[in-house]
Interface confidence: low
């Protein structure tokens, strides 16, 4: 059982709440507010929770709050990837997904959030202090990473509040000049809000466009950013890392990755149906359990793959140019 709550999303007042003139006057402030809240330094959020049904599993949610396009997501545990952390999954919006044991299923939930399920390790008790990190590479912001862990006092089934970028850092120089461009707009917004402070404040309403929007225990600017962007959280179930680190993939193959051509997105097919397809347009992702390919580049599946379709929220787009094959 999952316990989730709805984060209220900022919405412009509906017509009829005020006079037509008042509504028109408030359109610009709300547009500017959205821009001001979402502009500037991007953020990565991470949410960790434990599943009540599987005490050895966690749910982790990661997302990117920024306007750029995401080119790569790396999920790790035990610390930042490449700095003591161990990679659990790598997700690319066009080229597919690769995961490592004990990851069970990595997937895109939205255009800017991902999910990962980790197989229960069978440990007697989950490590509530395990740190999970998500690193988002995006253009033009650069690379941003945040980590989070389950609060020690968390009960099974309860989610920890999203932690926006506790160790946020920019690995690459991001193009953040848009903040300066919007500075005037933000100042103007404040001016307008001061002028309108005698009016009733607009209501905070649950977002109608994000039914899976996360619950937070407190309203904070980071949540405001999400709400304004209508970015729902992604779900990641993870299990505690065993002390020995010798975790085997539950189905025999420690890693797999694959991508499904757009034309196959409407009907699940076995590997034979699309194993030799040409470079596909970006469409959907398929999780192929143990479908690790490499006979000099292409690996036959260890076992019969189980197919799970996840539509790419960004829609089909042709891949950029021919690329080499080993």
């Amino acid at each position: 059982m999952r316990t989730e709550a709805q984060v209220p999303a900022l919405q412009p007042p509906e017509p009829g709440l005020e006079g037509a003139m008042g509504h028109r006057t408030l359109v610009l402030p709300w547009v500017l507010l959205t821009l001001c809240v979402t502009a500037g330094t991007p953020e990565v959020w991470v949410q960790v929770r434990m599943e009540a049904t599987e005490l050895s599993s966690f749910t982790i949610r990661c997302g990117f709050l920024g306007s750029g396009s995401i080119s790569l997501v790396t999920v790790s545990w035990g610390g930042p990837n490449g700095a003591g952390g161990t990679t659990l999954a790598v997700l690319h919006p066009e080229r597919g997904i690769r995961q490592w044991a004990p990851a069970r299923q990595a997937r895109w939930e939205t255009q800017s959030s991902i999910s990962l399920i980790l197989e229960g390790s069978g440990a007697s008790s989950p490590c509530a202090n395990t740190t999970f990190c998500c690193k988002f590479a995006s253009f033009p912001e650069g690379s941003w990473e945040a980590c989070g862990s389950l609060p020690p006092s968390s009960d099974p089934g309860l989610s920890a509040p999203p932690t926006p970028a506790p160790i946020l850092r920019a690995d690459l120089a991001g193009i953040l000049g848009v903040s300066g461009v919007l500075l005037f707009g933000c100042v103007y917004l404040l001016h307008l809000l001061r002028r309108h402070k005698h009016r009733p404040a607009p209501r905070l309403q649950p977002s109608r466009t994000s039914p899976q929007a996360p619950r937070a225990r407190a309203w904070a600017p980071s949540q405001a950013s999400q709400a304004a962007l209508h970015v729902p959280y992604a779900t990641i179930n993870t299990s505690c890392r065993p002390a020995t680190l010798d975790t085997a993939h539950p189905h025999g193959g420690p890693s797999w990755w694959a991508s499904l051509p757009t034309h196959a997105a409407h009907r699940p097919q076995g590997p034979a149906a699309w194993a030799s397809t040409p470079i596909p347009a970006r469409g959907s992702f398929v999780s192929v359990e143990n479908g690790l390919y490499a006979q000099a580049g292409e690996r036959p599946p260890h076992t019969g793959p189980g197919l799970t379709l996840f539509p790419d929220p960004r829609g089909p787009r042709a891949m950029e140019g021919p690329l080499g094959v080993r």
Partner: antibody
Amino acid sequence: QMQLVQSGAEVKKPGSSVKVSCKASGGTFSSSAISWVRQAPGQGFEWMGGIIPIYGITDYAQKFQGRVTITTDESTSTAYMELSSLTSEDTAVYYCARDDTARRVRGVPYYYYYAMDVWGQGTTVTVSS
Amino acid sequence: DIQMTQSPSSLSASVGDRVTITCQASRDISDSLSWYQQKPGKAPKLLIFDASNLKTGVSSRFSGSGSGTDFTFTISSLQPEDIATYYCHQYDNLPLTFGGGTKVEIK
């Protein structure tokens, strides 16, 4: 066949920095990961970090975090590794290495760190006062 | 970090002998393992990738096997030009790590 040509040997003072370059020719520079690996005299290999140019994302070994910076200039197909706060323990041969091409997964190219198929000739860095 | 334990650290064999080197990973790395040959003063040369795949152009007397945590590299018939140090390398997880090397000499 892709080739990697590195800059010449360097002699540095403790506390200074060194920047080693690695120029690629004969292949698509951005099509895979580039790693920097060092080998101290008579020792084994130590991965310092890497970059995947097509993603613009870098990864560093914890031991070198904050001291190493890996960059690329795609216009010249050159990768760079800068190591700061040098000590005598940084005396080593520094190699750049990369996958020859991206491997394909069911027809789809997938870039990450794999076997190092192409290596530079190495750059000897000596740190001495 | 994943530790790669390579053994033996050195060995001496006669021309024509079958030579076997082992590499053990501290955790499951699937088949994300490669083997390199390095001659003195030279850069390493990739021989085997993905645990058992022979790189194009490399002599078929070199072979690799194994999966998970235990891997083996074999030279079926040692030749004088095979005198070198051999290294295993895992690329299943970051940071990438290498074995300590096995120096192969001829008796």
